[in-house]
């Protein structure tokens, strides 16, 4: 229904706290360099204005669209051109072009320092002094580093953060209470960020149809007892919610997500028997819980899908009459029977089925042509299954750090032109798949591994798009989203690459490395490893292991030495010489 004042409508629906949080996220995601105080001031102004509209919907400007209101606020910021360069040109445009322009200027890799967590005492002091400001800082810092973070989900993580601080700041040993809990939230939030970015990429590059197909597969796996009409309704609503969030319409997105959660909880009987626990929770927790609810028990008996999709004499007629609906039912029927497959795999199977029908339904004897289609799925299914087995075996053998190194070598060989920091970040993230997925039960491994890898590779593609350097990466990133992971997996050593010259300074280390946290030490070593591969792309695993073991021994020795500086300056050059010899 139409409302006289959109801003009053959203303020009323969301309540002041969520309204303010979402406006802060929106501004932080659009203008990523502004300070918290600058954004907080704008948020307060917008909130005060929303209140006047709630009091009187026909007050001046209350009938304006949210894009107009927010865009006008952003464009009124002083020194916009000085701070943001060509983004200021967006302000010369009218809506909806202005908002599109802002979206295009979102930076997936902003040059901001890493978000450092203050030490426990300081954190608790500022939290106790002003919890609202403290949480505002959290929303601002996360949102500007992750400009596509799913806004209502970020409110959920802020709520988690709040609960952890409330609990731990009352403890004697604040540090040991906070650290593991906040690490857990950070890890989950980072995964949530790359997953959501993948959804927005799907929407931006391939449109709503592609996202809706993803949603149909995912929802059918989770709710195998829901009928196709129910799955379609949920997929349509979920697509709308994600379209809004990806498009920067965060108030509408959060409001519609709450509506969807309400609908699901009111219709549990036709959706799933597993929703009640989620539905008993307050709003943010409820929506989060529903988004990762366990799969419902499969129906006691389901037939094979061949009867409807291969053996039926009307296959081509049914397909021609309503292509998307027919393919949608195929995806639904296949997905509800296979919670053990990744969504990416299910979409590849549906794509193969579609291509087969396109080809066969134009032939003289269609049934003879498409009759073997289900058997032709075999290589598509076996490829990711083998990937999971190979990689999980390797992870179990090497552990997370060793597994990351193996992936780093592999990917540096595939795309040696990519910058070392990007390769290290990608390998570290890809390597976490072992810890995340390989310990799961057999039937959960494939969906976990492949859908996580796809999300990480999407980030690789986004970073590469900014500065394209590798034809291999461009090739894999240009294709469809579901083909990316198999494309990257199939890449081999880039034969066109001219090895980097050996520069001693790249492998020269100083005693300051000894005091770095373990994570930073690992990154330094992995940076050196990537550089080694760029110098010798065809080095064997044995050669690289020899060099890295030598390097680890050198660090261990010098960091234990009484005179660390002397050790580094005398032993360092020896290490460099040994490295060159080992790789010769």
């Amino acid at each position: 229904e139409a409302h006289k004042s959109e801003i009053a409508h959203r303020y009323n629906d969301l309540g002041e706290q969520h309204f303010k949080g979402l406006v802060l996220i929106a501004f932080s995601q659009y203008l990523q360099k502004c300070s918290y105080d600058e954004h907080a001031k704008l948020v307060q102004e917008v909130t005060d204005f929303a209140k006047t509209c709630v009091a009187d919907e026909s007050a001046a400007n209350c009938d304006k669209s949210l894009h107009t209101l927010f865009g006008d606020k952003l464009c009124a910021i002083p020194n916009l051109r000085e701070n943001y360069g060509e983004l200021a040109d967006c302000c010369t445009k009218q809506e909806p072009e202005r908002n599109e322009c802002f979206l295009q200027h979102k930076d997936d890799n902003p040059s901001l320092p890493p978000f450092e967590r203050p030490e426990a005492e300081a954190m608790c002091t500022s939290f106790k002094e002003n919890p609202t400001t403290f949480m505002g800082h959290y929303l601002h810092e996360v949102a500007r580093r992750h400009p596509y973070f799913y806004a209502p989900e970020l409110l959920y993580y802020a709520e988690q953060y709040n609960e952890i601080l409330t609990q731990c700041c009352a403890e004697a040993d604040k540090e040991s209470c906070l650290t593991p809990k906040l690490d857990g939230v950070k890890e989950k939030a980072l995964v949530s960020s790359v997953r959501q970015r993948m959804k927005c990429s799907s929407m931006q590059k391939f449109g709503e149809r592609a996202f809706k197909a993803w949603a149909v597969a995912r929802l059918s796996q989770t709710f195998p007892n829901a009928d196709f009409a129910e799955i379609t309704k949920l997929a349509t609503d979920l697509t709308k919610v994600n379209k809004e969030c990806c498009h920067g319409d965060l108030l509408e997105c959060a409001d519609d997500r709450a509506e969807l959660a309400k609908y699901m909880c009111e219709n549990q009987a036709t959706i799933s028997s597993k929703l009640q626990t989620c539905c008993d929770k307050p709003l943010l927790k409820k929506a989060h819980c529903l988004s990762e609810v366990e799969h419902d028990t499969m129906p006691a008996d389901l037939p094979a899908i061949a009867a409807d999709f291969v053996e039926d004499q009307e296959v081509c007629k049914n397909y021609a009459e309503a292509k998307d609906v027919f393919l949608g039912t195929f995806l639904y029927e296949y997905s509800r029977r296979h919670p053990d497959y990744s969504v990416s795999l299910l979409l590849r199977l549906a794509k193969k089925y579609e291509a087969t029908l396109e080809k066969c339904c134009a032939e003289a004897n269609p049934p003879a042509c498409y009759g073997t289609v289900l058997a032709e799925f075999q290589p598509l299914v076996e490829e990711p299954k083998n990937l999971v087995k190979t990689n999980c075996d390797l992870y179990e053998k090497l552990g997370e750090y060793g597994f990351q190194n193996a992936i780093l070598v592999r990917y540096t060989q595939k795309a040696p032109q990519v910058s070392t920091p990007t390769l290290v970040e990608a390998a570290r993230n890809l390597g976490r798949v072992g810890t995340k997925c390989c310990t799961l039960p057999e039937d959960q491994r494939l969906p976990c591994v492949e859908d996580y890898l796809s999300a990480i590779l999407n980030r690789v593609c986004l970073l590469h798009e900014k500065t394209p350097v590798s034809e291999h990466v461009t090739k894999c990133c240009s294709g469809s989203l579901v083909e990316r992971r198999p494309c990257f997996s199939a890449l081999t050593v880039d034969e066109t690459y001219v090895p980097k010259e050996f520069k001693a300074e790249t492998f020269t280390f100083h005693s300051d490395i000894c005091t770095l946290p373990e994570k930073e030490k690992q990154i330094k070593k992995q940076t050196a490893l990537a550089e080694l591969v760029k110098h010798k792309p065809k080095a064997t695993a044995e050669q690289l292991k020899t060099v890295m073991d030598d390097f680890a021994q050198f660090l261990d020795t010098c960091c234990k030495a009484a005179d660390k500086d002397t050790c580094f300056s005398t032993e360092g050059p020896n290490l460099v010489t040994r490295c060159k010899d080992a790789l010769a």
Partner: nanobody
Framework: EVQLVESGGGVVQPGGSLRLSCAAS????????MGWFRQAPGKERERVVS????????YYADSVKGRFTISRDNSKNTVYLQMNSLRPEDTALYYC????????????????WGQGTLVTVSS
């Protein structure tokens, strides 16, 4: 440890009948679709028939429709294959297999396999 043990194979004349059995252990039988596959000498393994978890649905290969019947007894953790009107081209090693998730009845969906039982149709 999951085990599937086939029995009932043997030599039979064309037009004759055989009943194969497959006893399963080490898995929750009623949670698995079951299937029979066969491999003739020098040929690829092929799908024969499969049956849904509850036994309400079956899916036959065209070559055996009307001659073979699959059934299961979940209380006995056993699946059966009644083979009538046997032909020389039915000669093969018959494998029993179990699939936790079942959509197409194709080989790649089956997680566990038996060692096979030999059926020879010859006059």
């Amino acid at each position: 440890e999951v085990q599937l043990v086939e029995s009932g194979g043997g030599v039979v004349q064309p037009g004759g009948s055989l009943r194969l059995s497959c006893a399963a252990s080490g898995l929750t039988f009623s949670s698995y679709a079951m299937g029979w596959f066969r491999q003739a000498p020098g040929k690829e393994r092929e799908r024969v028939v499969s049956i849904s978890r509850g036994g309400g649905y079956t899916y036959y290969a065209d070559s055996v429709k009307g001659r073979f019947t699959i059934s299961r007894d979940n209380s006995k953790n056993t699946v059966y294959l009644q083979m009538n009107s046997l032909r020389p081209e039915d000669t093969a090693l018959y494998y029993c297999a179990a699939a936790r998730y079942w959509a197409t009845g194709s080989e790649y969906e089956f997680d566990y396999w038996g060692q096979g039982t030999l059926v020879t149709v010859s006059s």
